[in-house]
Interface confidence: low
């Protein structure tokens, strides 16, 4: 399926609006510090060029690859060296090395100011004055802060963003209409970004075999009535889509995602009974809906797995003939029977099964050796079950804020070398698992909790890779994707850590505390808590609780005072002294 001009092919397939949106996202994800106007100019130039290629595919440069065209365009940015330093060296390279170089310089934690939400009237005026620029600005701001955001999904978010403003800027109470919608989009967007970041890490750090195994397990849970060959086809196509998006090939990715949605909707009967309502929707919504579709009902008459995978005398023969096929079918069969297991658990079981076959198929009596293989799964299954049970009990007992604090203490003791902002961000997100998953019925708790934790821990891994400070974190992040969460769970207090020297400045607070939102206050307190643990890693829960209770009382007292700043200046040192004494 070769085309004389790739850029013309993608422009025609995607249409001008999506083409321009995707090119803007691609450029913003690569050059995260460039001003909006510069990106818009580059996108317009690329779009005009694409139109000339649509008119005449044999026109000059139209036969060049998209990487060549886009890379050449990015390398025209005049301030590349000043703004990006060594990233400018990428421009001296030839494709495909140049694109790889740009990818390596994507920054997961760019030094960009947090997005401030203007007044509703200000936003509505901007929306009405120039809708197109307003929506481009949204794509740009999200893409530069989330350089691995799933591009076709970001177009769907932008469509919802537009719909929210179109509806709410007409409403009697604009703020009451708009703000909850924007909060929802923000939270969903952050979750979507983190989920996609795990997919890209899986592909980039562990290869497409790891991603395919994940996809086989997840799609088999979603589509338990589909045949293995059908699941395999979907896995192949999905792997291609995500490989492209993670590799910066956003036009190809969006085009292939649309093809996959089309294929799924044309073959619903052999995939799932749950696809129908998705397939009636327009493209962006349809693709989103298909990605989020609920699990189909399991076929009623599924036989026991033991017959083919334990009791059969042909297990080693079948395994030796095509190891990946046999293991893939095992994973498919196990996953379609277990929507109640996390994907990561299913992958651990497949790994354990593979290890048993490797050992037993070389033994004198293979059948005797692997006869008890399913019994070996029991501890692997019970470990996440117990973890979810214990943590949900703790969450229900403490509530979200205090549950986050318990996790902050736990993780700071495990890996105290990690920066305080990273520990606060990651532990706060780990703590959100409670509200997200603990209210669900038993059968949905583990897949919700463990697969969510995998996403959050990947964020820790990605941030740590940028600035490595802990061998333990490196080990848990790089040794095995499926065992990351158990690896972190198993970490104990780091005995080798030298406690951080006490710094009174860290525990000095001012009257600006009183004007912070509830969330910002929590972050301030949790930052102090992490610093306390870094200073006294062996402090008991009771000691830490006492200090944090005193802290809350001190802040509350000073925020009620007439002269707030004077209160903080007077009471602050007393709080610090009392805390040091309590922790001595």
């Amino acid at each position: 399926d070769t085309h004389k001009s790739e850029v013309a092919h993608r422009f025609k397939d995607l249409g001008e609006e999506h083409f321009k949106g995707l090119v803007l996202v691609a450029f913003s994800q690569y050059l995260q510090q460039c001003p909006f106007e510069e990106h818009v100019k580059l996108v317009n130039e690329v779009t005009e060029f694409a139109k000339t290629c649509v008119a005449d595919e044999s026109a000059e440069n139209c036969d060049k690859s998209l990487h060549t065209l886009f890379g050449d365009k990015l390398c025209t940015v005049a301030t590349l060296r000043e703004t990006y330093g060594e990233m400018a060296d990428c421009c001296a390279k030839q494709e495909p090395e140049r694109n790889e170089c740009f990818l390596q310089h994507k920054d997961d934690n760019p030094n960009l100011p947090p997005l401030v939400r203007p007044e509703v009237d200000v936003m509505c005026t901007a929306f009405h004055d120039n809708e197109a620029t307003f929506l481009k600005k949204y794509l740009y701001e999200v893409a530069r802060r989330h350089p691995y955001f799933y591009a076709p999904e970001l177009l769907f978010f932008a469509a919802r963003y537009k719909a929210a403003f179109a509806e709410c800027c007409q409403a009697a109470d604009k703020a009451a209409c708009l703000l909850p919608k924007l909060d929802e989009l923000r939270d969903e967007g952050k979750a979507s970004s983190a989920k996609q970041r795990l997919k890209c890490a899986s592909l980039q750090k562990f290869g497409d075999r790891a991603f395919k195994a994940w996809a086989v397990a997840r799609l088999s849970q979603k589509f338990p009535k589909a045949e293995f060959a059908e699941v395999s086809k979907l896995v192949t196509d999905l792997t291609k889509v995500h490989t492209e998006c993670c590799h910066g090939d956003l036009l190809e990715c969006a085009d292939d995602r649309a093809d996959l949605a089309k294929y799924m909707c044309e073959n619903q009967d052999s995939i799932s009974s749950k696809l129908k309502e998705c397939c009636d929707k327009p493209l962006l919504e349809k693709s989103h809906c298909l990605a989020e579709v609920e699990n189909d009902e399991m076929p009623a008459d599924l036989p026991s797995l033991a017959a083919d995978y334990v009791e059969s005398k042909d297990v080693c023969k079948n395994y030796a003939e095509a190891k990946d096929v046999f293991l893939g079918m095992f994973l498919y069969e196990y996953a379609r029977r277990h929507p109640d297991y996390s994907v990561m658990l299913l992958l651990r079981l497949a790994k354990a099964y593979e290890a048993t076959l490797e050992k037993c198929c070389a033994a004198a009596d293979p059948h005797e050796c692997y006869a008890k293989v399913f019994d070996e799964f029991q501890p692997l299954v019970e470990e996440p079950q117990n973890l979810v049970k214990q943590n949900c009990e703790l969450f229900e007992q403490l509530g979200e804020y205090k549950f986050q604090n318990a996790l902050l203490v736990r993780y700071t003791k495990k890996v105290p070398q990690v920066s305080t902002p990273t520990l606060v961000e990651v532990s706060r997100n780990l703590g959100k698992v409670g509200a997200k998953c603990c209210k669900l019925p038993e059968a949905k708790r583990m897949p919700c909790a463990e697969d969510y934790l995998s996403v959050v821990l990947n964020r820790l891994c990605v941030l740590h890779e940028k600035t490595p400070v802990s061998e333990k974190v490196t080990k848990c992040c790089t040794e095995s994707l499926v065992n990351r969460r158990p690896c972190f769970s198993a970490l104990e207090l780091d005995e080798a850590y030298v406690p951080k020297a006490f710094n009174a400045e860290t525990f000095t607070f001012h009257a600006d505390m009183c004007t912070l939102s509830e969330k910002e206050k929590q972050v301030k307190k949790q930052t102090a808590l992490v610093e306390l643990v870094k200073h006294k890693p062996k402090a008991t829960k009771e000691q830490l609780k006492g200090v944090m209770d005193n802290f809350a009382a001190f802040v509350e007292k000073c925020c009620k005072a007439d002269d707030k700043e004077a209160c903080f200046a007077e009471e602050g040192p007393k709080f610090v002294a009392a805390s040091q004494a309590a922790l001595a």
Epitope: S232, V235, T236, A322, D324, G328
Partner: nanobody, 115 residues
Framework: QVQLVESGGGLVQAGGSLRLSCTAS????????MAWYRQAPGQQREFVAR???????NYPDSVKGRFTISRDNAKNTVYLQMNSLKPEDTAVYYC?????????WGQGTQVTVSS
């Protein structure tokens, strides 16, 4: 379904060369990986070479440096160039293919290396 047809097998002297071909037909758009396996009498089937759609290859140590797998996507054909053949390379050679794993198999072609 995908159909695979191997050709190019035969009798060759030790130290000689052979080139096997395998042509795929049917639902080939889903094929990502193609491979060669072999099975000697009384032995288990053994992996020989694999190539992905993008062209990345891998081989076991027993054939590395002697065998080369290549692929012509336009002709839906995969080749196995076998040089410096040894008597222990005697086997039925099977072509295999699949979207994620090699799940479709050919009938096999006999390769005999005489000393």
């Amino acid at each position: 379904q995908v159909q695979l047809v191997e050709s190019g097998g035969g009798l060759v002297q030790a130290g000689g060369s052979l080139r096997l071909s395998c042509t795929a037909s049917g639902s080939i758009e889903s094929i990502n990986r193609m491979a060669w396996y072999r099975q000697a009498p009384g032995q288990q089937r053994e992996f020989v070479a694999r190539i992905s759609k993008g062209g990345s290859t891998n081989y076991p140590d027993s054939v590395k440096g002697r065998f080369t797998i290549s692929r012509d996507n336009a002709k839906n054909t995969v080749y196995l160039q076998m040089n410096s053949l040894k008597p222990e390379d005697t086997a039925v050679y099977y072509c295999a293919a699949g979207p994620v794993w090699e799940q479709f198999w050919g009938q096999g072609t006999q390769v005999t290396v005489s000393s």
